[in-house]
């Protein structure tokens, strides 16, 4: 649950180019904020194996982050 | 960006009743779940409630028959009905929810949490 984790970055360093589609349970995208200037990529792994960061620059995450924006508006 | 707007937290005596809502900042929205979770201080973070597109809904043990979950899909909103409040109901409840983009994988959404108080 990374979201309630308050004050400071989650990711820590770059981050993962990429995962496995076929291994991920779920994603969170985390916008800037007062606790973090930058857009965090979390990705949670099926089998109960864990989180990984994506780096948001990479081409995995920046398909991420624009399929969510082109849904909102 | 999305955001799960909620409401209808509050004071209540031991014995009454709240009725939580959730609702998603945008329409056309492809929800695979929605639900809710609680968090008492000191204590960690747990499932309250679920409800799932096409699948089962599941509750913590120590809510059923006293916390009803249901979803409005037009409004794309869920609501946590809480019957019967005890004293260990009193945490901080967060609304959760994942949502389809057509990834192969849903993106998770959480509220801010609203504050429940059993007290008398």
């Known amino acids: 649950f990374p979201m309630f984790k308050r004050g400071r970055c989650l990711c820590i360093g770059p981050g993962v180019k990429a995962v496995k589609v076929a291994d991920i349970e779920k994603a969170s995208i985390m916008y800037p904020s007062n606790n973090c200037d930058k857009i965090e990529v979390i990705i949670t792994l099926k089998e109960n194996k864990g989180q990984r960061c994506l780096n948001p620059k990479s081409k995995q995450a920046r398909l991420i982050i624009k399929k969510v924006e082109r849904k909102n508006f | 960006e999305v955001q799960l707007v909620e409401s209808g937290g509050g004071l209540v005596q031991p014995g009454g009743s709240l009725r939580l809502s959730c609702a998603a900042s945008?329409?056309?929205?492809?929800?695979?779940?929605m639900g809710w979770f609680r968090q008492a201080p000191g204590k960690q973070r747990e499932l309250v409630a679920s409800i799932t597109r096409g699948g089962p809904t599941i509750y913590a043990d120590s809510v059923k028959g006293r916390f009803t979950i249901s979803g409005d899909n037009a409004k794309n909103t869920v609501y946590l009905q809480m019957n019967s409040l005890k004293p260990e109901d009193t945490a901080v409840y967060y609304c959760?929810?994942?949502?389809?983009?057509?990834?192969?994988?849903?993106?998770?959404?959480w509220g801010q949490g609203t504050q429940v108080t059993v007290s008398s």
């Open positions: 959760n929810a994942l949502i389809d983009y057509g990834l192969g994988f849903p993106i998770e959404y």
């Open positions: 945008r329409s056309g929205l492809s929800i695979n779940a």
